[in-house]
């Protein structure tokens, strides 16, 4: 879902799933501000104090990142200009499952959207004949 209206910007997320032990993506898009230095992207996880990831003023700010995500997150910095706020999550763990919030702030306003991230062994098993 997303929030829109005066002083709010529309943020869109998509429920997704991650394979344990592989890299996953939590998808989030928004209408990008041309002033990239004014864009703040924050990823939060329900039940976790601290941030999953923060990107502002054109670079990562991981000073408030929760330790369970340390070294495992990245945004697509070169894609922020086209409204891609998606989060890359490395080495997905079972405990990464849950409700995440993608929060965006620009010079025009702010908005957020939630997504449910499921984790598990979703890859098709190999069948040897």
């Amino acid at each position: 879902f997303g929030i829109s209206g005066k002083h709010f910007i529309t943020v869109t997320t998509f429920t997704s799933a991650g394979n344990i032990g592989e890299d996953g993506t939590l998808s989030c898009t928004f209408e990008p501000d041309i002033k990239l230095n004014g864009i703040v992207i924050q990823w939060l996880k329900e039940g976790i104090k601290g941030l999953v990831h923060e990107f502002k003023e054109g670079k990562d700010d991981l000073s408030q990142q929760h330790e369970m995500f340390r070294g495992r997150t990245a945004v697509f910095a070169d894609q922020v200009v086209v409204g891609n706020a998606s989060l890359r999550l490395k080495n997905v763990q079972l405990t990464d499952a849950g409700t995440y919030t993608c929060y965006i702030r620009t010079s025009k306003g702010k908005g957020n959207a939630n997504l449910e991230y499921k984790t598990g062994a979703f890859s098709m098993p190999e069948i040897n004949v």
Epitope: P32, V82, G83
Partner: antibody
Framework: EVQLLESGGGLVQPGGSLRLSCAAS????????MHWVRQAPGKGLEWVAS????????YYADSVKGRFTISRDNSKNTLYLQMNSLRAEDTAVYYC?????????WGQGTTVTVSS | DIQMTQSPSSLSASVGDRVTITCRAS??????LNWYQQKPGKAPKLLIY???IRESGVPSRFSGSGSGTDFTLTISSLQPEDFATYYC?????????FGQGTKLEIK
């Protein structure tokens, strides 16, 4: 083929008006921000104005603020630049460009000459 | 406003030479820098975006580097078709600003 095609340039007297158009084809126009950039004869590139994909963000260079208006019609895949109170220093080739990771697609340009 | 200063303004070189053009921003722009090539009478062409990522279809002899305030465009081995004017451009904030250009001429 991804393409931008400008039109609407010409000779105009100081104080006059022109409306430039930029017709987009070969890509989903409504998904991209757009820019106008100009180049005076023998000079470098100068950014003029930008508009985001849904027109939520619009910005102008100080040199054209209050005189030029950027707009878009996503249903027609067209970008516009309304230029009023034109001055001699507005004489230039005007390019529209797609806002991606860099201005990755440019039109061929349309020439605006402001002279009495 | 963020000023973009390119050096040199012009450069004479020969086919096969390695050439480096520098671009300096008046304040930090992270990695939000593009490089363009323009030939006379033609529209600019995007070469490098986000300081170091080569645009699709651009030959590998073109490379970009840098972050913060100092950036470089390198052409590893000049080809005849590379003689043109090169511009850097920041897209960190408005007004979007270009360098004054570097004209690369045949020696």
């Amino acid at each position: 083929e991804v393409q931008l095609l400008e039109s609407g340039g010409g000779l105009v007297q100081p104080g006059g008006s022109l409306r430039l158009s930029c017709a987009a084809s070969g890509f989903t126009f409504s998904s991209y921000g757009m820019h106008w950039v100009r180049q005076a004869p023998g000079k470098g590139l100068e950014w003029v104005a930008s508009i985001s994909s849904s027109s939520g963000y619009i910005y102008y260079a100080d040199s054209v603020k209050g005189r030029f208006t950027i707009s878009r019609d996503n249903s027609k895949n067209t970008l516009y630049l309304q230029m009023n109170s034109l001055r001699a220093e507005d004489t230039a080739v005007y390019y529209c460009a797609r806002a991606s990771s860099g201005m990755d697609v440019w039109g061929q340009g349309t020439t605006v000459t402001v002279s009495s | 406003d963020i000023q973009m200063t390119q050096s040199p303004s012009s450069l004479s070189a020969s086919v096969g030479d390695r050439v480096t053009i520098t671009c300096r921003a008046s304040q930090s722009i992270s990695s939000y820098l593009n490089w363009y090539q323009q030939k006379p009478g033609k529209a600019p062409k995007l070469l490098i975006y986000a300081a170091s990522i080569r645009e699709s279809g651009v030959p590998s002899r073109f490379s970009g580097s840098g972050s913060g305030t100092d950036f470089t465009l390198t052409i590893s081995s000049l080809q005849p078709e590379d003689f043109a004017t090169y511009y850097c451009q920041q897209y960190y904030t408005t007004p979007l600003t270009f360098g004054q250009g570097t004209k690369l001429e045949i020696k």
